[in-house]
């Protein structure tokens, strides 16, 4: 059965998928599709990589991690209820019947309406992101509370720190990871 991930309308959703390249730069083609993994490849492709680079993508879908190191986790920007459903991450390992297939279920919940105090900006509105907790069960969505007014440089720095610390470390534990070679 599919592992379940959650996000709220307007946030970015994160669907983890990882593999370990046999050698640095020795990449494996990967495709992401909307819908369960079929017999081969991905149907309704939203993004794919080849042995060198991302060679196909559609708007709102991107790889935020370092795919050259095997982090092929999918970020879906500014999700709506229509983004709910099953997504396929397929790691196309060469050989006979070697592909690794992961079906991930994305559940989109309506945004919580919370009154914000005056003179404060909601950080998640400016930089929506889904943070996933460590563990083996369904991932929980954490939303960041409001922060006082800060300038764009500070927001950018904070966003980078969040991405680098929480996403690079915590999310790796809850994603599908395989080693190649």
């Amino acid at each position: 059965s599919e592992v379940e991930y959650r996000a709220e309308v307007g946030q970015n959703a994160y669907l983890p998928c990882f593999y370990t390249p046999a050698a640095p730069g020795n990449l494996v083609p990967v495709c992401w599709g909307k819908g369960a993994c079929p017999v081969f490849e991905c149907g309704n492709v939203v993004l794919r990589t080849d042995e060198r680079d991302v060679n196909y993508w559609t708007s709102r879908y991107w790889l935020n991690g370092d795919f050259r190191k095997g982090d092929v986790s999918l970020t879906i920007e500014n999700v709506t209820l229509a983004d709910s459903g099953i997504y396929c991450c397929r790691i196309q390992i060469p050989g006979i019947m070697n592909d690794e297939k992961f079906n991930l279920k994305l559940v989109i919940k309506p945004a919580k309406v919370t009154p914000a105090p005056t003179r404060q900006r909601d950080f998640t509105a400016a930089f929506p992101r889904m943070l996933t907790t460590r563990g083996h069960g369904p991932a929980e969505t954490q939303t960041l509370g409001s922060l006082p007014d800060i300038n764009l440089t500070q927001i950018s720095t904070l966003a980078n720190e969040l991405r680098d610390s929480r996403l690079a470390n915590d999310l790796r534990d809850s994603g599908a990871t395989i080693r190649i070679g």
Epitope: P38, V39, F40, E41, N44, P94, D99
Partner: antibody, heavy 123, light 108 residues
Framework: QVQLVQSGAEVKKPGASVKVSCKAS????????MHWVRQAPGQGLEWMGI????????IYAQKFQGRVTMTRDTSTSTVYMELSSLRSEDTAVYYC????????????????WGQGTTVTVSS | EIVLTQSPGTLSLSPGERATLSCRAS???????LAWYQQKPGQAPRLLIY???SRATGIPDRFSGSGSGTDFTLTISRLEPEDFAVYYC?????????FGQGTRLEIK
């Protein structure tokens, strides 16, 4: 024009092997997957497996695993299907069929078929 | 394995009539992964419909496909003499790829 030309009819004895070829022309050979499908006399269609002509991915139907081998030769744009340990139930017409998945199209369908190769297994 | 059951087994109609062919899957199939083929005696199959409802190149618009989940339909709005053949549905959703047993469309 796009076409798939298969090798000629074969008559084999039970226990033998048969190797059927399928030569592609009129398109970029390595851009499209190739299926093998068979049809016993008066029966329906049965999928045997699929090969990515880049050579990096092959999937066999479980029913044929261990008996079927699919290979390709990019220099001649040809795919091959070898079936071993033949029995009378393997008497059928064997088709290669290109899947039009790829080249920016991410739907599935066997859009070009070979003319078929009749394999008769008889003692 | 996903079993596709086609009905009716044989359909007898006259040219000009409307034909409705059914394909039922033993478990849900994404519409993206369903196709229909036509086969005439002594010939290879021909792709008619992919993605449950998209016509393949060169297929006349009297052929249409619909459905989702476990129930799919191929409709031929006005039968032409060349449409009498065997029709197969096929799924790509899970291995092995499977075909229905076929519906024979014959002239009444």
């Amino acid at each position: 024009q796009v076409q798939l030309v298969q090798s000629g009819a074969e008559v084999k004895k039970p226990g033998a092997s048969v190797k059927v070829s399928c030569k592609a022309s009129g398109y970029t050979f390595t851009s499209y997957y190739m299926h093998w499908v068979r049809q016993a006399p008066g029966q329906g269609l049965e999928w045997m497996g699929i090969i990515n002509p880049r050579g990096d991915s092959i999937i066999y139907a479980q029913k044929f695993q261990g008996r079927v081998t699919m290979t390709r030769d990019t220099s001649t744009s040809t795919v091959y299907m070898e079936l071993s340990s033949l029995r009378s139930e393997d008497t059928a017409v064997y088709y290669c069929a290109r899947d039009f998945y790829g080249s920016g199209n991410y739907y599935y369908g066997m859009d070009v078929w070979g003319q078929g190769t009749t394999v008769t297994v008889s003692s | 394995e996903i079993v596709l059951t086609q009905s009716p087994g044989t359909l007898s109609l006259s040219p000009g009539e409307r034909a409705t062919l059914s394909c039922r899957a033993s478990q849900s199939v994404s519409s993206s992964y369903l196709a229909w083929y036509q086969q005439k005696p002594g010939q290879a199959p021909r792709l008619l419909i992919y993605g449950a409802s998209s016509r393949a190149t060169g297929i006349p618009d009297r052929f249409s496909g619909s459905g989702s989940g476990t129930d799919f339909t191929l409709t031929i709005s006005r039968l032409e003499p060349e449409d009498f053949a065997v029709y197969y549905c096929q799924q790509y959703g899970s291995s092995p790829i499977t075909f229905g047993q076929g519906t024979r469309l014959e002239i009444k």
